[in-house]
């Protein structure tokens, strides 16, 4: 309810009649409440007869005039108590007070909601002097009111170190509903309930809310703001908005899209970033996420060799960074690679498969059955071996690398020999007599040098020894190579 300024018990006519420049607005004052249709001019309630001071905050001057008559208490006159008007309208209101002429330099300040209004406000103070008193009228005008102008306005005047304060003038700016909470876009699970919230405020209140789904009203009768719409579930995307109505009319919120979560689309553009003999680095562009964040991805790898058993290797990885290094692959092999990613709803289909090849690698095993013996007549050491298994060559054999280390008292000398891939024997000349020769052999491909075989040692005696048995790599399971003399 609108409360009006109080009537006073002890009238004291300081300034009879209405003042020049009294209350004005840009529209006719009315004394009826606004009806539901809204669009009314401002309402003004002025409960007083002109010329009655209030007893609110009164300064009682101690000064007396020449005739020694005590001066009356000073107080602002009553004015309009509550102004209701529509946004963008203009309004002017005032405070008035009659001050004995003995007071000099009186100034009136305007305050809103406890803060002094300074600067670019349209405040004008007019003085109307008479023989004994000066009528002061302070007017405040707002050319186009906004909601932020809502509030309680008062005048203050300082006299004799006393502060005189007027009754408040309440300005209520009414307009269309203003949304304080609008529905927000969401991604929801199919056929699962969810809530949307809409809140709008006046003044004027009440504000009533209608919900709209895909251009159709959800509720034909409104709900008071704030309103929560519980949607029992959707099977397809929908757009929701809300309408807010009050006595000034209606406003419409933004429309928000509610998406249904689905399995993701398959990744696209799977590409090979880098290949080695035993690994392939791939990247991919994720497909549409189905309105639900990706959780992880699965890389599927099949041997492309038609003779392979068609088994699929699966490597799981995080969804980011759309990059994965596939390891433990065979060298010089062809693979088909596909990528699939999942969200909370499920797995996408597999991306288009791409072909990728590993490069040639260094052999993964050493030559087998290395045998070493001394041919004294030619002063050579003969070495024999068996090729590593083809599968483990990891490429096309281009030759072998032989390491032979000669050790005698105080001397150690390592020499490397490269031999071609044809055959499986080699001959090296004796470097030092009365020494131990340690031989190791590695297979070589264009991919590099493979592991060296276990060392085989042979003792090369001083000149004149007769019989030498060959040395060889041990049979599997033996811990150390054995030198046979």
């Amino acid at each position: 309810a609108i409360t009006e300024a109080r009537e006073e018990a002890k009238p004291y006519p300081l300034f009879p009649g209405p003042f020049p420049g009294s209350l004005q607005t840009d529209h006719t004052p009315l004394l009826s409440l606004p009806h539901a249709s809204g669009y009314q001019p401002a309402l003004m309630f002025s409960p007083t007869q002109p010329g009655r001071p209030h007893t609110g905050n009164v300064a009682i001057p101690q000064v007396t005039s020449v005739e020694s008559k005590p001066l009356p208490p000073l107080a602002f006159k009553h004015t309009v108590g509550h102004i209701i008007l529509s946004e963008h309208k203009g309004v002017k209101f005032n405070c008035s007070i009659s001050v004995p002429n003995i007071y000099q330099d009186t100034t009136i300040s305007w305050w809103k909601d406890g803060k002094e209004l300074l600067g670019a406000h349209h405040a004008i103070t007019q003085f109307y002097p008479d023989d004994e008193v000066t009528a002061i009228i302070a007017s405040f005008s707002i050319t186009s009111v906004q909601r932020s102008d809502n509030g309680s306005y008062i005048c203050k005047m300082k006299i004799n170190n006393e502060e005189i304060v007027s009754d408040p003038i309440y300005i209520e700016v009414q307009g269309l509903p203003h949304f304080t909470k609008q529905p927000e876009s969401m991604n929801v699970t199919r056929n699962t309930a969810f809530n949307l919230t809409c809140q709008a405020v006046g003044p004027p209140e009440p504000v009533n809310i209608f919900w709209v789904q895909n251009s159709s009203r959800v509720n034909e009768q409104p709900e008071k703001s704030p309103s929560v719409l519980t949607v029992p579930g959707l099977t397809e995307m929908a757009v929701f908005s809300c309408e807010a109505h009050n006595d000034k009319g209606l406003t419409v919120s933004k429309g928000v899209q509610i998406n249904i979560k689905a399995i993701p689309s398959p990744p696209t553009e799977v590409s090979i970033r880098n290949s080695t003999a035993h690994s392939i680095l791939i990247s991919w562009v994720p497909g549409f996420d189905g309105y639900s964040p990706f959780r992880n991805c699965s890389i599927q790898v099949k041997e492309a060799d038609p003779l392979s058993n068609g088994s699929v290797m699966i490597f799981n990885t995080s969804a980011l960074p759309h990059l994965y290094q596939i390891k433990q692959l065979q060298a010089l092999a062809n693979y088909s690679i596909g990528v699939s990613c999942m969200n909370e709803i499920g797995w996408s289909a597999v991306s288009p498969w791409i072909l990728a090849s590993t490069t040639e690698g260094a052999p993964s095993v050493a030559p087998l059955n290395v045998t070493v013996f001394l041919n004294e007549s030619s002063d050579n050491v003969d070495i024999r071996w068996m090729k590593p298994p083809t599968k483990q060559q990891d490429g096309e054999l281009v030759g072998y690398r032989i390491s032979h280390v000669w050790q005698s008292a105080g001397i150690s000398k390592e020499l490397l020999e490269e031999v071609g891939q044809n055959g499986s024997r080699a001959r090296i000349s004796v470097q030092v007599h009365n020494a131990t020769c340690t031989v190791r052999i590695a297979a070589v491909t264009r991919g590099g040098v493979g592991p060296f075989s276990d060392p085989v040692k042979i003792f090369i005696p001083a000149h004149g020894w007769v019989d030498y048995a060959p040395s060889s790599t041990p049979a599997p399971g033996n811990a150390d190579p054995v030198l046979i003399i």
């Epitope: 539901a36 249709s37 009533n208 034909e220 009768q221 409104p222 009050n246 209606l250 406003t251 419409v252």
Partner: antibody
Framework: QVQLVQSGSELKKPGASVKVSCKAS????????MSWVRQAPGQGLEWMGW????????TYADDFKGRFVFSLDTSVSTAYLQISSLKAEDTAVYYC??????????????WGQGTTVTVSS | DVVMTQSPLSLPVTLGQPASISCKSS???????????LNWLQQRPGQSPRRLMY???KLDSGVPDRFSGSGSGTDFTLKISRVEAEDVGVYYC?????????FGGGTKVEIK
């Protein structure tokens, strides 16, 4: 002052279509809605439905779903009622009325002068 | 739909005398917020309808206070304390509590 001015009388043959206009002035058109009300000769009033002048969202009473369409041209502050496949029983005066939901409920506060639609072969 | 029944259909009155129109609804018009959205329209001869009263008893601006409304639930009354010549026309009650909005059949007020 809000004013709603409707288009003139129409005489149509059964099966034809008619489009009645309602031009608003004196207020911001998109801050309210427009209801349409039918008054058949010698009969009472029937509420046909309403359209939100901002969003164009329409609501129709059950008896007026299908052949009746509300539309807007906000650039000229005008609401329209189109009736297709006219029948003799569509003969009536059609009123537009400004509408929204205030503290006193649905408002219906300003009415057009009415458009008479006569359907006769 | 809510059926609104007005009586009498026709109401001949003497100028300066009171008049009373009854409106009954097939369902209560009291909504969950405690408001009753029962309204009255006046349609003078050859004119458009005009809003007269809302929320049972609140007069629209510019409506003379010789008009008054009362009632609750399903039974409502429009009274004119002293009928004047300008009051001649058809009066309709209508409800906005339930969807769709529905009107009474109208009561024709004429001077005897």
């Amino acid at each position: 002052q809000v004013q709603l001015v409707q288009s003139g009388s129409e005489l149509k043959k059964p099966g034809a279509s008619v489009k009645v206009s309602c031009k608003a002035s004196g207020n911001t058109f998109t801050t309210y809605g427009m209801s349409w009300v039918r008054q058949a000769p010698g009969q009472g009033l029937e509420w046909m439905g309403w359209i939100n002048n901002y969003s164009g969202v329409s609501t129709y009473a059950d008896d007026f779903k299908g052949r009746f369409v509300f539309s807007l041209d906000t650039s000229v502050s005008t609401a329209y009622l189109q009736i297709s496949s006219l029948k003799a029983e569509d003969t009536a005066v059609y009123y537009c009325a400004r509408d929204y939901y205030g503290s006193g409920g649905w408002v219906f506060d300003y009415w057009g002068q009415g458009t008479t639609v006569t359907v006769s072969s | 739909d809510v059926v609104m029944t007005q009586s009498p259909l026709s109401l001949p009155v003497t100028l300066g005398q009171p008049a009373s129109i009854s409106c009954k609804s097939s369902q209560s018009l009291l909504d969950s917020e405690g408001k009753t959205y029962l309204n009255w329209l006046q349609q003078r001869p050859g004119q458009s309808p005009r809003r007269l009263m809302y929320l049972v008893s609140k007069l629209d601006s510019g409506v003379p206070d010789r008009f008054s409304g009362s009632g609750s639930g399903t039974d409502f009354t429009l009274k004119i304390s002293r009928v004047e010549a300008e009051d001649v026309g058809v009066y309709y009650c209508w409800q906005g509590t339930h969807f769709p909005r529905t009107f009474g059949g109208g009561t024709k007020v004429e001077i005897k």
